[in-house]
Structures are given as C-alpha cells and as structure tokens.
C-alpha cells in the first residue's frame, strides 16, 4: 500500500511570505505525486510549485491559495491512488487604503460646529486595530469632542472646530503587520492664529552617502514657529546639531538638508509647527536607505518556431522600486521589433530556431543591480526511430506496441484505440520511450491502434492493427455463489467462448447425476421447482478440440426471500422528546437491518449519544431536534437479497396550551408516546 510518511498540516501563513505543505510517501513501487486545490490539480508556477513531493510557496497569495489542499500519490503500475489529509492556510494580510470623508457628503459642506466623520480604508485578516492621527499625533478614544469607533474604522468629530484642523491619517495593525493610510485627509476649519500646513515633508529614499532634503512649511497669523526633531526627540538646529546629524542644515523656509547620509541617519524626522493659539502640528517623514533583494530563479522555457511567447520578470523587492530591463548576448533589448521588451516582459514574436539561448533580466535601483538568466529552447518536430507494427496478441497475456521517436525537447507520446484516446489505467501503460503495454489483452482489444508523438513544434503519427488470439473462457464466468428462492422456478446460465465454439455441460460437484426435475439445456441449468435438496456445489464444464476444457464451480443456496414483519410508520414527535421507528424483517438466512437517515447510512459505531439501533432493528432518537426531521429508510438484507421500506419523521414545537385548555387537552397532531429529556 501507499503510505504517507509526512502529511500536509493546516497552518498560519503570511501574505507574500514563503510557506511549505509537506508530503512524503512510501510505496512498494514508483509513484507520482501531485496536488489538488479544492479538488482541482495544482499547476506549477514560479510562485507555487512542487518541490519533491511537497508543495512550495515562494509568496503566499490570499486569493489564489485560499481553499483546501490535498496531496495525492498514484502508483501508475497498479492504479492504486491514496489521498492525504486536507490542509489549508489561515492567511494573514493587511492592505493600505485612503482616509475618506464619510460625513458630510462633501468638503464644501464642512462648517464649524458640524459633525465630521472620517473613515479609514485599511483592511486585513485578522481584522486590524485602528489608530487615528492628527498631524502625526495619535488620537485616543475619550478625548474631548471626538469618538473613535474601532469596529467601524470611523473617527467622528462633534462638533468640529478650528482646533480640529489638520492632516488626518490612520494606521492599522494586526498579527500580520501594520499599514498606514495611502492618502490622508486635510481638514481645514479656519482660525488664523492656528498653525496650518502649507507644505508637508515627504518620505525620502536615498543611496548611502547621497543627500536628502525634507521640505516643511506652516502658516498662521502671527507667523508660527517651526522646529525639526529626529527619532529620539533630539532637536535639530544650525547651532546645536546632535552628534549623528553633524551634516544637517535647517533653511529659513523650513527645509532640512542632510548630506552624506549614513544608515544611522535613517529614521523618522518630525517637523513641528506652533501657532499663537491651538495645538502644535507635528508632521512626520521617514528617511529610508535604498536597498535591493535577490531575484527569483527562472525555470527553463520551451517555445515553438513561428509562435509568440512572453517571459515575465518579477522585479526584486527594493527601495525605491527597481527598474527592469532585458538583455540578450550582452545587448539590451529594444522596446519594439520582433524580440523586444514590453513593461517587465520579454516578448518573442514569430520565434525562430536562432532565438534559442540565454536571456538576462536586469533590475536596478539606487542600491545596486541584480540579474537572472532564463534559458530558452526552441522545439523541433519529432522523427521516427520505430513505428508500431501490425501484431497478433494472445488474450490474457501482456501485449506491446512500439512508438519510438526523437525530438527537442523529449516528445510526448499518446495512444488512440479506435480513434479514442487511451488514458493510462490498470490495463494500459505507456512507457517513457512511448511503447504501449496492454497488461492483460482482451478480445475487444483486437482493433486499430494509433500513436501520436508531439512536441510544442508539431507531431507525427502511425497506426497498426492488433489481432487477438482468443482463449477458452466463460462469458461471463458464473457467479461462484448464487441464491435460489425456495419453492420457485430457477435457472443458472453458463456460456463460454474460444477459438472454436465450445460444448457446455453441468454436473454436480460430487459427480452424482442431476435429478430428473433439473435439466441442462445448452448450458442453462433449469430447476422446475426449487427444493432444499437442490442446494449444493455444481460444476459447469466447457470444452473444445484445440483448447481442452475449463471448469467453473458454483455453490447454490436455497433461501426464503426477505419480508417485513414490522414497518416504520409516519411519526410526529415534539422537539426534545424521543422518537421510535420500528422495523423487523424475516427471511432465511436471517436478515440484518441497517438504517438510512436523510440520504446517509447511519453507522452504528458513529451514531453519537442521541441515536441507537436495537438488536431487533428498531431505531430510537433521543432529544429530537428540527434537523432530525426527514425520511428514514429501514434496509433489510442477507446474503441472498435486500429490501427496504421508509417513513417520514416530523419534529414539531410543543404548543403552548391556552387558558381554556385543561391539562388533558389532546395535542393538534397524532403524537407517539415518548419520554422527555430535561437539560440542566
């Protein structure tokens, strides 16, 4: 048997990060392993691909990787297939979005003393926790004049006044990470003495030892003050610079210049504006050092002459976003022509054999350059080494038909039988070299076979006729165990075929002759009226000249067929009470009883505490609930036959008795008598 040494497990995963679903198999022979996602085969991509028997994810995607994964192992020789446990990802992600005005409908409608509601459009799983900022300062719930609704992601200012003016942003964090608003909202409720933002500093990315400039301007009457701070709250002025910011200059217009930037200069810079009245405005901007990661490897590609193909180059992660270009033989590809670059894609139009070779994708930004090669092969049409030949194959033995071809890349061979594609199963096997093996030749295998050898460049085909040398056999083989109904007429057929039409006769297995009421007519054993003595072992003998004789042994059982003594009745039960569905059957051999409830067999070993099937076949359901309503089928079966009977079960609410009704009032339904289970 195929055994899973390692099975995939359900697990947490982070959007865009690596993950691995493990699968490891032990089997007596070679097996091929593939993966299913929600029952459909998983195709390899550069992002998600088989790694040995396991499934590797270079970057988990919450849309493409949601669902149930299963590892399937198949032994192509025996046809045995085994499936692993199901596994799924709990994918954690967060996605930025803008701050938008929810109320009033437009900015023009914002007046002092009106209610203003802002909404943070950041989403994620698990649901993130939101934090609001005004001019970079966190707003906590319960502060005067505003309400933060974390569930609704809303910030409500009531009533809005000049002190609420400023740049509103939001951030959200979860187990996955954090994101801040991609677009912020400036609320302007005029008060001349309050500082207002004229120019806000922007995040900057620079290469090591380059310079960086942050601009910052506020306006107010009288003019506001402006101060710069770095990370640890150290003020930056032209007179007193902190030791790690010796090369910082603050200009009269509020701009901050940093020269010869080093890693220790990276971080958050705060620009603070203070008017005569109102709160200080704190604006933040981050200085990032440029960086670039390595690029993922390309799989080799196979293309056909004359076609158009594209190869996508995923740029490596980097700050700033790296630019991408393609080169071939050391020359950068143009943006038009037959072989050219379009966006991040390499495009090969009307491919020629001469286009084969190594193409290089380059990515670069301020931090440096990365490159990755892709090997492109141009496919050729297959040619013959050995065509299939007309063949005589013996029934019941393996048969082989050759189909040997060569090409670049290695050709794929498929076989057709009577113009129908042969899918590999327990009888047919296509070897790596294209040879077809018929594991056990059958009479109807005598027909035309055609093999087709293909590469992406084209295909060739040839056909051959198979003649089957038929063996002497029963058609069909008589069932080794058969039942006859006591006191009724019965027939037991036996027929056979061979290279010559065989003679067929019946005899009792002990050699004794058949009784006079039993006749053997051209292979059909006929019992005029079955008696108990007719039970026993019989032998059917088929023979012809060239192939000798064959025998089939049949054990005949005499039985009394099943009838129901007690059948289940249509039953109505109050919710919480006990339902009893009775069923009793008789026959010989004594029948066994099974129940089917709501289209599934009730397994006595898995019924749970509420259901029980008694020895006599009756089904009891305690503490019935509305979902127990439905059709219940009693199935009685023995080694000779099977019968079933069904009845509906209705579960209803117990009616509340009206004032006028006494305790003895009859219920509105025909109820069965049950015991009530009390819940504590």
């Amino acid at each position: 048997a195929i055994v899973f040494i390692k099975q995939p497990s359900s697990q947490d995963a982070l959007q865009g990060r690596r993950a691995l679903l493990r699968c490891e198999v032990e089997a007596p022979g070679p097996v091929h392993v593939y993966w299913l996602l929600d029952g459909a085969p998983v195709q390899d991509t550069e992002r998600r691909f088989a790694q040995g028997s396991s499934l590797s994810f270079a970057a988990v995607d919450r849309l493409q990787d949601s669902g149930t994964f299963q590892c399937v192992a198949r032994d192509d020789v025996t046809g045995e297939e085994a499936r692993s446990a199901n596994a799924s990802f709990n994918i954690k992600w967060i996605e930025a979005g803008p701050v938008v005005l929810k109320h009033p409908a437009s900015e023009a409608e914002i007046q002092p003393q009106t209610q203003v509601t802002l909404r943070c459009h950041i989403d994620g799983h698990p649901r993130p926790t939101y934090q609001w900022f005004r001019d970079g300062t966190p707003l906590s719930d319960g502060q005067s004049n505003h309400t933060v609704s974390s569930k609704e992601r809303n910030l409500t200012l009531r009533p809005a006044g000049p002190e609420h003016s400023g740049l509103y942003s939001c951030c959200a964090h979860s187990a996955f990470g954090q994101a801040c608003s991609s677009q912020n909202f400036t609320l302007s409720i005029a008060d001349e003495s309050f500082a207002r933002v004229v120019l806000a500093p922007q995040d900057v990315v620079v290469a090591r030892y380059e310079e960086a400039m942050f601009h910052c301007q506020f306006s107010a009457q009288p003019p506001p003050s402006l101060q710069w701070l770095f990370e640890d709250e150290t003020p930056i002025t032209n007179r007193s610079r902190p030791p790690h910011l010796r090369r910082a200059t603050v200009f009269a217009n509020g701009s901050l210049l940093l020269t010869q930037v080093r890693p220790r200069n990276a971080g958050i810079y705060r620009c603070i504006g203070q008017g005569q009245r109102g709160p200080p405005i704190i604006l933040e901007a981050t200085l990032h050092l440029a960086e670039i990661e390595d690029m993922p490897l390309f799989e080799p590609r196979v293309f056909t002459a004359g076609s158009e193909e594209r190869v996508t180059c995923l740029p490596p992660k980097g700050l700033p976003e790296p630019s991408v270009w393609w080169e071939h033989a050391g020359v950068r590809l143009p943006t038009h022509g037959r072989v050219y670059q379009k966006g991040h894609e390499l495009v090969l139009a009307n491919i020629a054999e001469s286009d084969a070779g190594v193409y290089t994708c380059h990515a670069a930004n301020l931090a440096g350059q990365r490159r990755q090669d892709v090997n492109i092969t141009v496919a050729t049409v297959p040619s013959w080494l050995k065509k299939p030949q007309d063949s005589q194959l013996e029934e019941g033995k393996p048969g082989y038909l050759d189909c040997l071809t060569q090409a670049t890349p290695k050709p794929t061979v498929v076989w057709y039988r009577n113009q129908m594609l042969i899918s590999e199963d327990s009888r047919f096997e296509v070897f790596k070299n294209g040879t077809l093996r018929i594991n056990s030749v059958e009479v109807y295998d005598g027909t035309w076979y055609r093999c087709m050898s293909s590469t992406p460049a084209g295909s060739i085909e040839a056909q051959a006729r198979v003649q089957v040398l038929e063996k002497l056999k029963f058609t069909p083989p008589p069932q080794p165990q058969q039942c006859m109904e006591f006191d009724k007429e019965a027939t037991v057929p036996c027929s056979a075929t061979g290279r010559e039409k065989p003679t067929i006769k019946w005899e009792r297995a002990d050699g004794s002759s058949l009784p006079e009421w039993v006749t053997d007519n051209a292979g059909t054993l006929h019992f005029a009226r079955v008696t108990r003595d007719d039970a026993g072992n019989y032998t059917c003998i088929a023979s012809n000249g060239p192939q000798g004789q064959i025998r089939a042994h049949v054990q005949l059982t005499v039985a009394v067929f099943i009838t129901f003594k007690v059948e289940p009745e249509r039953t109505t039960v109050y919710q919480g009470h006990t339902a009893l569905l009775q069923c009793e059957a008789q026959g010989d051999p004594k029948p066994l009883i099974q129940w089917k409830g709501k289209d599934r067999i009730l397994d006595p070993t898995k019924l749970g505490p509420r259901m029980h099937i008694f020895q006599n076949g009756s089904l009891v359901i305690h503490d019935v609930a509305p979902e127990d309503s439905g059709r219940y089928t009693c199935i009685a079966g023995n080694s000779c036959n099977i019968k079933h009977t069904e009845a509906p079960l209705y579960v209803v609410d117990k009616p509340v008795p009206e004032e006028s009704e006494g305790p003895g009032s009859p219920p509105p339904y025909k109820m069965i008598q049950t015991h009530h289970h009390h819940h504590h």
Epitope: A1, V3, K6, Q7, S9, Q11, E26, A27, A87
Partner: antibody, heavy 120, light 107 residues
Framework: QVQLQESGPGLVKPSETLSLTCTVS????????VYWVRQPPGKGPEWLGV???????NYNPSLKSRLTISKDNSKNQVSLKLSSVTAADTAVYYC??????????????WGQGTLVTVSS | EIVMTQSPDFQSVTPKEKVTITCRAS??????LHWYQQKPDQSPKLLIK???QSISGVPSRFSGSGSGSDFTLTINSLEAEDAATYYC?????????FGQGTKLEIK
C-alpha cells in the same frame, strides 16, 4: 490469527549491540509493514522505526545513527539491531503490525514484548 | 516531529464517575489521532482510532472527540477494570509520537 513474537537476549552490556527478532504469523511481510516500539520502565511508548513491504525503512531521527531494521520474508522474521547501547536503552521492546492503510496507521496488533536490560 | 501533550498526568476516580482525558498536538493533525489503554505487564490495546471511531470489542463507555490539535477521550461510567494508563498517538505524520500518558486509579 495475527501473531507477533519478539525474541532475543534479556541482558546486554553497555556499548554492545542489542539484537532482537520478531517472528510473525497470520499475515505476510510482503503485504504489511512492521514497526518496532519500545517502552522504558514507567514511561510512555517510543516509536523506533518501520520496515515496509518493499524493504525500505524509516527510523526515528533520534536513533537513526544507531538503528538498523531488516527482514527475511521467507522466514517471516523482522530483526532490529541497536548499536552502542547505554542504560537509557533499557526498555520493553515490541514489534507491531502496520494496519496496511495509507497513513501512519493504528497499532492494533502488538507482540507481547520482551524486556531488555542494559547493564554490566 | 509532532509533540503530543496529555493532561492530567494522574487521576484518581470513583467507579461510575465520568472521566475526561485531553490530548494536544503541537500542530494541526486533522483527525489522525488514536487512543490506547495499557494495563501493567500488558501490551498497549487500541481503544479509539481516528479521533472518534470506536473499535470492535471495546466497551461503548469509551468515546473520543476532537479535530485539529485538541482531542478528548471520555469514559462515561468508570468501571474497576478501567484502571490503567491511557496514551494518545499522532497518526498524521512520521515519526508516530505518543503522549506521556495519563494514569487512572480507582478509589
């Protein structure tokens, strides 16, 4: 019916090799794999390794360097060899039939076990 | 490897009482968990397979439940013959690992 019987010396000296044989009946080693499991006195069972119908083996990573499992299908015998033993290898050793399914499997047929003591 | 943790380590119970033993796996193992009973000087005996499937010949008072990483063995009305040590086993991936065991004593 299915039976498994472990045999081998009850006493082994430290640094020597512990050798045990499991003789099976009621099933064929060409149809079912066999596990070895041990249980130190007063502790829970510990899975040692398995030999499959193909003759392939899997071992517990903690013992891989010291453990060898082999079999002789014709004699219906599976053998275990554990080298460089110490007192920590003192345990009751069981052989167990794999259930023939597609998974790690339930262990429903166990030998009666044989106690091996490591002592000088 | 998958680590299996049982609780409690020891329990002293009177006959007819309901007993619950829990088992936790270090990662999700779906329903690939089996329970065994072991009495002194005997081989372990299979009680429940695949988390909740009962075994022929095992009294119906033994039942199992759970899926993922948390599982429970329940003995509905304890009998004197149930004094033993109970183990859970990971049947999901190799190596098969056992819990440290729960010893059940009858008062």
């Amino acid at each position: 019916q299915v039976q498994l019987q472990e045999s081998g010396p009850g006493l082994v000296k430290p640094s020597e090799t512990l050798s045990l044989t499991c003789t099976v009946s009621g099933f064929s080693l060409t149809s079912y794999g066999v596990y070895w499991v041990r249980q130190p006195p007063g502790k829970g069972p510990e899975w040692l390794g398995v030999i499959w119908t193909s003759g392939n083996t899997n071992y517990n990573p903690s013992l891989k360097s010291r453990l060898t499992i082999s079999k002789d299908n014709s004699k219906n015998q599976v053998s275990l060899k554990l080298s460089s033993v110490t007192a920590a290898d003192t345990a009751v050793y069981y052989c167990v039939k794999h259930d023939g399914g597609n998974y790690v499997g339930v262990m429903n047929y166990w030998g009666q076990g044989t106690l091996v003591t490591v002592s000088s | 490897e998958i680590v299996m943790t049982q609780s409690p380590d020891f329990q002293s119970v009177t006959p007819k009482e309901k007993v619950t033993i829990t088992c936790r796996a270090s990662q999700s193992i779906s329903d690939y968990l089996h329970w065994y009973q072991q009495k002194p000087d005997q081989s372990p005996k299979l009680l429940i397979k695949y988390a909740s499937q009962s075994i022929s010949g095992v009294p119906s008072r033994f039942s199992g439940s759970g899926s993922g990483s948390d599982f429970t063995l329940t003995i509905n009305s304890l009998e004197a013959e149930d004094a033993a040590t109970y183990y859970c086993q990971n049947g999901h991936s190799f190596p098969p690992t056992f819990g440290q065991g729960t010893k059940l004593e009858i008062k």
